[in-house]
Structures are given as C-alpha cells and as structure tokens.
C-alpha cells in the first residue's frame, strides 16, 4: 500500500505515525493548496490541529478579512490558521473544538464543543457550535446562536458600533459579546479593566485579558 503523503489535518498526521508535536503541512482533499499548522500530538490523545494561538503578543491580530481568510502569524508561536481552510475542513466531516485558556495567576481552563464548523465565505464564516462541556464556564462565551465573522474592514456584527474596530481583532462578534480571543494582548498587571483585551467572560469575567489561548480542532470520531 502506498504511503499517504498529504494530510488534511493533524489527526491524519497522527494516525500515519507522526506523534511528535510540531508544524506540519496540511492539504485539503482535491486541493493543491498547502497550509502549515501546528499539531498537538500529546494533549488529550493527540491529533489536534491548532487553529489559533496567543501567548506573548508578538503577532498583530488586528488584520483584514483577507488575512483572516488565508491565515497569518507563525505556526510555532502566535497565529491564525485561516478561515477558508477551517471552513472547508469542518464541512467535510464532523469536528470538535477545544479552547484552552491560561490566566495570569497560573490557572488553566478549557471549553469543549462537541460539534464545530464554519460556514462558507459567502455566509461570512459564521460559527456553528453545539454541546459545551469543560471548566471555562457553563455558558458559552462564544455567543449562541453563532455570529458572522467580522474584521476591521468587514463589519458583520450586530452592534451599532463596529466591534472589530472597537475591540480589535477579527472574531464572531455579537454586540460585541462575551468573548474575543483575538483582542489586544496585555501583559501581566496591565490586564484588568480592559475594553479590548483577550476576553472569555464566563471564565474570568469582564475586562480580564488572558495570558494565553489555544483553539484546536479534531475529528469527532478520532
């Protein structure tokens, strides 16, 4: 049997025998377009495709629609994998989404959604989530039902304001909602009472800007 040389996600990479954390090249079926993604092969059984990471403020997340579409940053550090890739991937089979969070006091928490997918670009990459469990709040900090994605140059939120400009970063803003993991990165002791920080309300409350975030996906049948 010929060895598979292209992988659609980190679960396929893992199942092929590559069980070390790191950056891997992924390709969607029937596509030649490649993306570089970080694969977490250790957490919760491995096979996780990292679609977002914040850790040190080294990457500017106040980006355009096109940049959020194709992805930006450094897969080994802070980055956004890209809405188009994630939309296509999550519409081919069922995926779970795990969001891992760190605060400045050394605490960690997570939210796990048992079904996650993004609509197409024509539908503004609207987020769809179902089945929340985890330690980062009993209520979803991503507004339900899911909202369209907004960026500084694409105002698709439900606010009389422009949430992406007010809060910074691209996100599935409501008006503006209980979360924004792509907000401004604030260092320790400057991370409270922030109107535009990295927010996950149902874990840390209002105005608290987080130290670290990771959004990762994996097939539900992994």
């Amino acid at each position: 049997k010929e060895e598979q040389i292209s992988f659609r996600d980190c679960a396929e990479v893992f199942k092929s025998g590559h069980t070390t954390n790191g950056v891997y090249t992924l390709t969607l079926p029937n596509s030649t377009e490649e993306v570089k993604a970080y694969c977490d092969m250790e957490a919760g059984g491995g096979g996780w495709t990292i679609i977002q990471r914040r850790e040190d403020g080294s990457v500017d997340f106040q980006r355009t629609w096109k940049e959020y579409k194709v992805g930006f940053g450094n897969p080994s550090g802070e980055y956004w994998l890209g809405n188009e890739f994630v939309s296509q991937l999550t519409n081919q089979q069922r995926y779970v989404l795990k969001i891992h969070l760190k605060d400045w006091e050394g605490n960690e928490a997570y939210s796990l959604y048992e079904h996650f997918y993004l609509s197409s670009e024509e539908l503004n990459y609207r987020i769809h989530l179902k089945g929340l469990t985890g330690t980062a709040g009993k209520i979803s900090s991503i507004s339900q039902p899911g909202n369209d994605f907004s960026t500084k140059d694409a105002d698709n939120d439900k606010c009389i304001c422009k949430c992406s400009q007010m809060l910074t970063g691209g996100w599935w803003f409501d008006a503006c909602g209980p979360s924004n993991l792509n907000g401004m990165y604030y260092p320790q002791r400057q991370n409270t009472n922030k109107f535009n920080g990295i927010k996950w309300y149902y874990w840390k409350g209002s105005g608290y800007s987080l130290k670290g975030t990771t959004m990762m996906i994996r097939p539900a049948d992994f």
């Epitope: 606010c159 009389i160 007010m166 009472n193 209002s206």
Partner: nanobody
Framework: EVQLVESGGGLVQAGGSLRLSCAAS????????IGWFRQAPGKEREGVSC????????YYADSVKGRFTISSDNDKNTVYLQMNSLKPEDTAVYYC??????????????????????WGQGTQVTVSS
Amino acid sequence: EVQLVESGGGLVQAGGSLRLSCAASGFTLDDYAIGWFRQAPGKEREGVSCIRDSDGSTYYADSVKGRFTISSDNDKNTVYLQMNSLKPEDTAVYYCAAVPAGRLRFGEQWYPLYEYDAWGQGTQVTVSS
C-alpha cells in the same frame, strides 16, 4: 489606565438615604455608559441603574424605580446614585462599571452585564431595620 472608584456606602436605617459616588479616570463619561450594580451575599450581581451621557438616557431596575436617582457630573467625571427610602433588601455591595456607549445591539437600549469591562472595587451598603 482605566479606573473606577466607588464611595459613599455605609450603615443606614430603613427609610434613610445615601449618595454613592463613582469617580472615573482614564476615560471620559461622554463616550461611555456607567452602570450601578449590586451583589448581596449568596446572590447574583444585578443591575440597579445606568446612565449614558451621550444621549442623556437613564435606566432603573423595577425594584428601585422612584427611590433611586442616577446623575453625572462631567466636570468631575463622576456618576452619582442617590438612594432614598432605603429598605433592608437594598443591603449589598454596590459596584459601578463602564461600557463604551456604542456597544449596543441594534434596537436595544441597554447593555448585558458582560459588556461592562471596567469595574470598581465596590462599596458596602447596609440597611438595618
């Protein structure tokens, strides 16, 4: 740096009055709405009143309508909550909080709790019977 500092709390007999102050720094009241919230032991934090200077709007919870009055002094960048005819059930820690005035859903007048991103430390109000 955004800061909110409450003052004016204390112990008062039922039927008495108190005036709470919320001094804001790091932003101007013109661009923000200021809300007063309270939290009694073992209970959820609840909205009491809110003021939006940009259009002069005010909001009151049903439980305090006719008894509490919210106002602002832009020169002092301070919001006040005048509390009259106090009842024992008004006993709580009172907090003020700020939200950008424009962070409003189409067709709505006021803001969910999670939109208030800047909070004070609170001031204790105790109403004895």
